[in-house]
């Protein structure tokens, strides 16, 4: 008894396709060993036609595939464009030779069945409309017209010209004539369902002089399109249901035995399991829409169907499109934190992975919003201005070549809680979803800046200090000036670094930054932060206002005076020039060329600029003390 199992007999018709699934015992060896499909010859030899090692025979070229699904302990052989020559005995099996574990499969391919000579074949998808054409002679022009469906020997009337309609075709079937045509009538059957399939006879007149036409109606369930995606990557279901449902509510559902559970629809329904990682986007006015799901999980694998109906729910007899999604657990996308926690007033540093082969791609960060069908407005990007409401507290740090970039958000409030997406204009699979949870702070922040009301006077010296705890002793401390295109590191002076780490004094760990002399363009947000190499940690932000010197005021900044008194003898100031070019970036149109749900931040580039952050800070200087 073979432990391999599959269909013993497969029968099909010329031109069709078959998908033969073979089941194997769930062992590590079986999952990884060679899978094959071979044809049994009269001499007992089984000639390989296709194998998981990449072999494909000439007669299967361009029409067959073998796919292993180790998570299901199955492999599938797909064979298209069948001919009668494909009839024969086959084996599906495992092992390095074709003598290993196998299962015998008999495949029989028949000719397309013959119908009565005058039979017209109509092939339609579920939910669509068929128009059956019925010809008749002039002698039956005024006779009764009808369409009936063959059931065994009987033919049950579907509709006739006396306005009779079979109850199962009520509101779906109409009989009509076009224009002045005297030799043809039509029957429309809409919202087709599988049981509508069969042989129909249309008739004009009665008895031997009646005109009859045969029609074979085939109602096809959608063949699922196979989608193979990596764990943690994203998938887009492109749904095109046609103009006739353009104004109906749209949905995507996941098949669960007989039912199809709605994941998202245009009426606002959304499955909680997809919260924060799904977007439904109308594509045009013809009923086209797409559904994007990010952060794919193992349990997302399965059968999906999109459809349209005024209820936003699956309804028999309405058009659908189908997919089978496979989620590959051997993913190239690294595992990153899906939940990041912060506290009010604090900060978070979120690491976003991207395809390392695309280090020059533009990087973005957007905030997923639940309203309507979900949307994700870009908050910051490598060439996108920071969105209004995020000035001074959000920056993106690219680390070319590292396969990741970091997004820092500080001055956190509970309103910042929610879902955020990392994305690039490159490989669309590398979209990651992060849930940010912001709780109320219960203690003072780790980084504190003094003075807290920072006003610098033009032409004078201004020093600002950042106090950090001993736990950050070994980390690199920095000050940076925030602008719409990032936070540019400034020279600073770490006063705690002179002490030995053993005798760390909690009160004297300070990194300070001096502006000397203060210029008008020095006004803006400054960040104090810690980092270890490329790994960014806590940050805090302060807004430095710059004002003209009032007549008669002393030429010394009190803060600066305190700093100098403490740190005599005076040291020479280090000058640095940090250029902040005017940011006129627009998002690369390729990024969301097919995904309008992610709002283009570049569109608002000119109006989003906060007045305090505009302009060039050409000759800004910072001195270290």
């Amino acid at each position: 008894q073979s432990p391999i199992f599959g269909p013993q007999d497969v029968s099909s018709i010329e031109g069709n396709s078959v998908s033969i699934t073979c089941y194997y015992p769930d062992t590590s060896v079986n999952r990884h060993t060679r899978k094959y499909w071979c044809r049994q010859g009269a001499n007992g030899y089984c000639a390989t036609l296709i194998s998981s090692n990449g072999y494909l025979s000439k007669e299967y070229s361009g029409r067959a595939s073998l796919i292993n699904f180790p998570e299901n302990s199955t492999f599938v052989i797909n064979i298209a464009h069948l001919t009668q020559e494909d009839t024969g005995s086959y084996k599906c099996g495992l092992g390095t030779t074709n003598r290993g574990l196998f299962f015998d499969v008999s495949l029989e391919v028949s000719q397309v069945p013959e119908f009565p000579n005058d039979t017209h074949v109509y092939t339609k998808d579920i939910g669509r409309t068929v128009t059956i054409e019925c010809r008749f002679k002039e002698g039956n022009a005024h006779s009764k017209k009808s369409l009936c469906k063959k059931r065994g020997e009987a033919c049950e009337v579907v509709i006739d010209s006396t306005e009779y309609v079979d109850p199962s075709y009520k509101d779906r079937a109409i009989l009509f004539m076009k224009g002045t045509s005297r030799d043809i009538f039509y029957v429309n059957i809409s919202h087709l369902i599988p049981s509508d399939a069969g042989l129909y006879v249309c008739q004009a007149g009665e008895g031997p002089s009646a005109d009859k036409n045969n029609a074979d109606l085939q109602v096809l369930e959608p063949e699922p399109e196979l989608l193979y995606k990596d764990l943690r990557s994203s998938v887009t279901f492109e749904c095109d249901l046609g103009r006739e449902v353009a104004n109906d509510a749209k949905y995507l559902c996941r098949k669960n035995k007989e039912t199809c559970d709605v994941i998202i629809n245009t009426l606002g329904k959304r499955d909680p399991a997809f919260e924060g990682r799904i977007l439904l986007t109308p594509r045009d006015d013809n009923g086209r829409f797409s559904v994007l799901i990010t952060g794919l999980r193992k349990e997302d694998a399965g059968h999906y169907q999109c459809g349209a109906h005024s209820s936003g729910l699956p309804q028999e007899g309405w058009p659908v499109q189908a997919w089978q999604l496979f989620v590959n657990e051997e993913s190239t996308i690294p595992n990153s934190r899906s939940v990041v926690k912060g506290v009010t007033g604090g900060s978070v540093a979120i690491v976003c992975p991207y395809n390392p082969k695309e280090s020059s791609s533009l990087k973005y960060w957007c905030h997923w919003e639940a309203d309507e069908n979900g949307r994700c407005p870009v908050l910051v990007g490598t060439q996108a201005l920071v969105q209004e409401g995020y000035e001074g507290r959000l920056a993106l740090f690219d680390q070319p070549g590292s396969g990741a970039y970091t997004v820092i958000l500080n001055q956190l409030t509970t309103q910042d809680s929610g879902f955020y997406w990392c994305l690039t204009d490159g490989d669309s699979r590398w979209r990651t979803t992060i849930e940010l949870q912001v709780a109320e702070a219960t203690k003072k922040p780790d980084l504190e800046v003094t003075p807290q009301n920072a006003t610098a006077v033009i032409g004078e010296t201004f020093t600002i200090s950042c106090h950090y705890p001993c736990k950050f002793y070994s980390q690199e401390k920095y000050w940076c000036k925030w602008s719409n295109d990032g936070c540019h590191i400034l020279p600073s002076h770490d006063e705690g670094a002179r002490q030995s780490s053993v005798s760390c004094d909690q009160s004297s760990q300070i990194v300070s930054m001096t502006l000397n002399p203060v210029k008008k363009e020095d006004e803006g947000w400054y960040w104090c932060g810690v980092k270890e190499g490329q790994v960014y940690g806590e940050t805090t932000a302060i807004y430095v206002a710059v004002e003209e010197r009032t007549r008669g005021s002393p030429h010394i900044n009190p803060t600066d005076a305190n700093a100098r008194a403490k740190d005599a003898p005076e040291e020479e100031a280090m000058e640095s020039s940090v250029r902040e070019d005017e940011n006129k970036a627009n998002l690369d149109p390729r990024l969301f060329a097919d995904e309008r749900e992610i709002q283009n931040a570049g569109d608002q580039a000119q109006e989003n600029r906060a007045s305090g952050n505009a302009g060039s800070a050409g000759g800004q200087s910072g001195s270290s003390k």
Partner: nanobody
């Protein structure tokens, strides 16, 4: 909802034949799987045979090893009925035979009870001399 009604069970001598039928009513599908399972007294229910079909006229027939070559599963095209022709019956074939249906087509393992949503009440087959 789909209702399944089995018929054709009865008493037969070893070596004899029986033809079981399973008629589906209610919602119908252009592609689904119908299977036969059996349960002998004091035993667990086990897979016997299944047939899957798709709207393009392709059929897949599955059998458990113990019935291969003796039992044949088929589908009546005009009706939504599945038949199990049982030849060369043995006393160990004695059981209640259940018909089951699923619309998952050719995707799930037809041997697994979990793949089937709808079940009939069962028909008793007794093979005895």
């Amino acid at each position: 909802e789909v209702q399944l009604v089995e018929s054709g069970g009865g008493l037969v001598q070893p070596g004899g034949s029986l033809r079981l039928s399973c008629a589906a009513s209610g919602r119908t599908f252009s592609s689904y799987t119908m299977g036969w399972f059996r349960q002998a007294p004091g035993e667990e229910r086990e897979f016997v045979s299944a047939i899957s079909w798709s709207s393009d006229g392709t059929y897949y027939k599955y059998y458990t090893d113990t019935v291969k070559g003796r039992f044949t599963i088929s589908r009546d095209n005009a009706e939504t009925t599945v038949h199990l022709q049982m030849n060369s019956l043995k006393p160990e074939d004695t059981a209640v035979y259940y018909c089951a249906a699923s619309s998952s087509g050719t995707y799930g393992d037809p041997r697994s009870e979990r793949e089937y949503r709808y079940w009939g009440q069962g028909t008793l087959v007794t093979v005895s001399s």
